[in-house]
């Protein structure tokens, strides 16, 4: 489809010359961020963004590229490298110590330095990096967790947590040896290392005594308490804050987050991860974006202000189950989750960075008609006379062969929320991608990001934005509509 | 110019099926996109059903989504609306639309035919 305004010069022309109009009035604020907000999108290349555009657009009845994300309106944008000290290729839980603590790690350690060793708890003390979102509780802000993932989960722990194995769920989980040598899981860790005034996601299961049934699947053993410990860590966190509420369900958490008596706020909303997106109950789990909504509410009474860390978690597991259709209408709900943070706050006073902890082989190519679906297929076929999608990974769980040979596919097939696409090499689960990831960035000091950057110069632009340590001595004005 | 000659309609039991043809002359398609409307008694005219002549993209009212298929045969250019499980309330005046997509205005619909009418019976 060729829209008639495209074939005149002018358009593009008189379009250029708009946002050359609003680049040359950008001011970069030199006051200081009263507010953080750190959105990070798990899994979120740059291919995801670009196909999340278009199917966004589409749904909009739009041919697809032309329609802006949220993310999208930022005006600040710089690359970062996402490495682990260890690996080209990283993990969620290094690259959350890097741009949550500013410091790199090695691959599947969360919290500590590279001088910590995967899995050998002994090399844990003394290697902690302590998280923007920690230093921030320190200098009197009230900070909150958002994920769709479990709220133990790699990404958000980052913000409360220091462990040599990310997969040290709860006490379950660690071995004898490592619980001995006094490595605490990390749901313990959500309760106990800091005061968290707001926690969403999933992950009940972590926090109650195994045995204990699911409020939600009561009749699944399987989705019940996992503690051997014998503790009930909601119990404990309730006990040790006065206007604390726990939820489960999503009526619960608009009551509580309207509730001007509650303080602070931890909602499960599942025993593990959060439903995707297009499988969710809506009478029953929230929305990122409602999630996201409810913590601003409770976060932005702190006259000192926040800092927020909000995970669109589940990009990355539909990419690796090779399903782009998870991934990318996770990416879309992210993407509202991010215009809905940007109408309840202001970017005079609030820092908003969008990023990704990595990216995933998934690519998006083949010549496509525009305006024809992102899940469609390449208009010719490939040298075995058969169809393929304009959307594939490197690899995964999507390479089959049928009778000696790569199957063909239907545009019916293709579009199904189920489909899992092509690769070129079978795993069982489709692998992260090494390649720069961007960061978008508004409101104050956000013209700092800029250029190609490490991953851990994200955690030091929010930290001297906010003037938190080691950037006390920050030398900004005040954030706007606040005096000294 | 583009002329536009609807056919196909008729009535019909319910549950049966119709195919209404839409034949364009005067000039060929190229990258004009076909959209299907009706306009039943004293009601707005509504979307139905389009799709652009390359068949980069189609999209189906939620009324009709599964029983209706929107084709289109270049060599005859000719639009073709293959109407199946058709129900009472699917009575109506029947038009197809040719037109180009628009970045401002959307899809946008210059010409259009001088309809078919669909009666389903029940």
């Known amino acids: 489809i060729i829209p008639v305004e495209e074939e005149n010069p002018d358009f593009w022309n008189r379009e250029a010359a708009e946002a050359l109009g609003a680049a040359k009035k950008l001011q970069p604020a030199q006051t200081a961020a009263k507010n953080l907000i750190i959105f990070l999108g798990d899994g979120m290349g740059v291919s995801t963004v670009t196909a999340a555009r278009i199917l966004k657009g589409q749904k909009k009845d739009k041919l697809g590229p032309e329609i802006p994300l949220a993310m999208d309106r930022f005006p600040y944008v710089a690359l970062s490298k996402t490495y682990n000290v260890d690996k080209h290729v990283p993990d969620s839980g290094a690259t959350a110590t890097a741009y949550l603590c500013g410091v790199k790690g090695n691959f599947q350690t969360i919290g500590l330095s590279a001088a910590a060793r995967f899995n050998q708890c002994n090399t844990t003390r003394g290697n902690e990096v302590i998280s923007v979102m920690n230093r921030a509780k320190k200098a009197g802000k009230s900070v909150g967790v958002v994920t769709t993932t479990r709220v133990q989960h790699a990404s958000p722990a980052g913000t409360y947590a220091h462990t040599v194995n990310r997969n040290w769920y709860s006490d379950a989980d660690v071995p004898a040896s490592a619980r001995q040598e006094g490595c605490q899981d990390i749901a313990t860790q959500l309760i106990s290392n800091m005061d968290i005034d707001v926690i969403l996601g999933g992950g009940r299961k972590y926090m109650f005594r195994m045995g204990t049934p699911d409020p939600e699947y009561p009749d699944d053993y399987s989705q019940g308490g996992t503690r051997l410990d014998g503790k009930n860590l909601v119990q404990e966190w309730l006990a040790k804050r006065q206007g604390a509420r726990y939820v489960w369900n999503r009526t619960e958490l608009m009551q509580a987050s309207l509730d001007p008596s509650v303080t602070h706020l931890m909602g499960l909303f599942e025993p593990g991860d959060m439903k995707y997106e297009i499988h969710r109950d809506s009478t029953l789990d929230p929305s990122l974006m409602e999630m996201t909504e409810a913590a601003l509410r409770l976060l932005s009474r702190n006259p000192r202000g926040f800092f927020l860390f909000v995970e669109g978690g589940r990009i990355d597991h539909g990419h690796h189950e090779s399903r782009a259709y998870r991934a990318l209408t996770e990416t879309i709900m992210f993407d509202d989750a991010i215009e809905r943070a940007g109408q309840l706050t202001s970017e005079e006073d609030t820092l908003s960075l969008v990023t990704a902890d990595h990216s995933h082989v998934f690519s998006f190519g083949g010549y496509p008609l525009r305006g024809s679906s992102i899940f469609g297929l390449a208009p010719g076929k490939a040298r075995d006379r058969k169809a393929y999608t304009v959307l594939l990974y490197g690899n995964g769980p999507g390479y089959v062969l049928k009778d000696g040979a790569r199957p063909d596919v239907t545009e019916s097939e293709s579009g199904s929320p189920e489909y899992r696409q092509q690769s070129a090499v079978p795993l069982d689960e489709e692998t992260h991608a090494g390649e720069d990831v961007a960061v978008f960035a508004r409101g104050p000091q956000a013209h700092l990001v800029h250029g190609v950057q490490e991953q851990t110069f994200i955690a030091h632009v929010m930290a001297f934005a906010a003037c938190l340590e080691p950037y006390t001595a920050c030398d900004l004005a005040p954030p706007a509509g606040t005096t000294d | 110019q583009v002329q536009l000659v609807e056919s196909g309609g008729g009535l019909v039991q319910a549950g049966g099926s119709l195919r209404l043809s839409c034949a364009a002359s005067g000039r060929a398609f190229g990258d004009y996109n076909i959209g299907w409307f009706r306009q039943a008694p004293g009601k707005e005219r509504e979307f139905v059903a389009r799709r652009t002549w390359d068949g980069s993209s189609t999209r189906y009212d939620d009324s009709v989504k599964g029983r209706f298929t929107v084709s289109i045969d270049n060599a005859k250019n000719t639009a073709y609306l293959q109407m199946n499980s058709l129900k009472t309330e699917d009575t109506a005046v029947y038009y197809c639309?040719?037109?180009?997509?628009?970045?401002?205005?959307?899809?946008?619909?210059?010409?259009w035919g001088q309809g078919t009418q669909v009666t389903v019976s029940s």
């Open positions: 639309a040719a037109g180009r997509y628009s970045r401002v205005r959307g899809w946008e619909y210059d010409y």
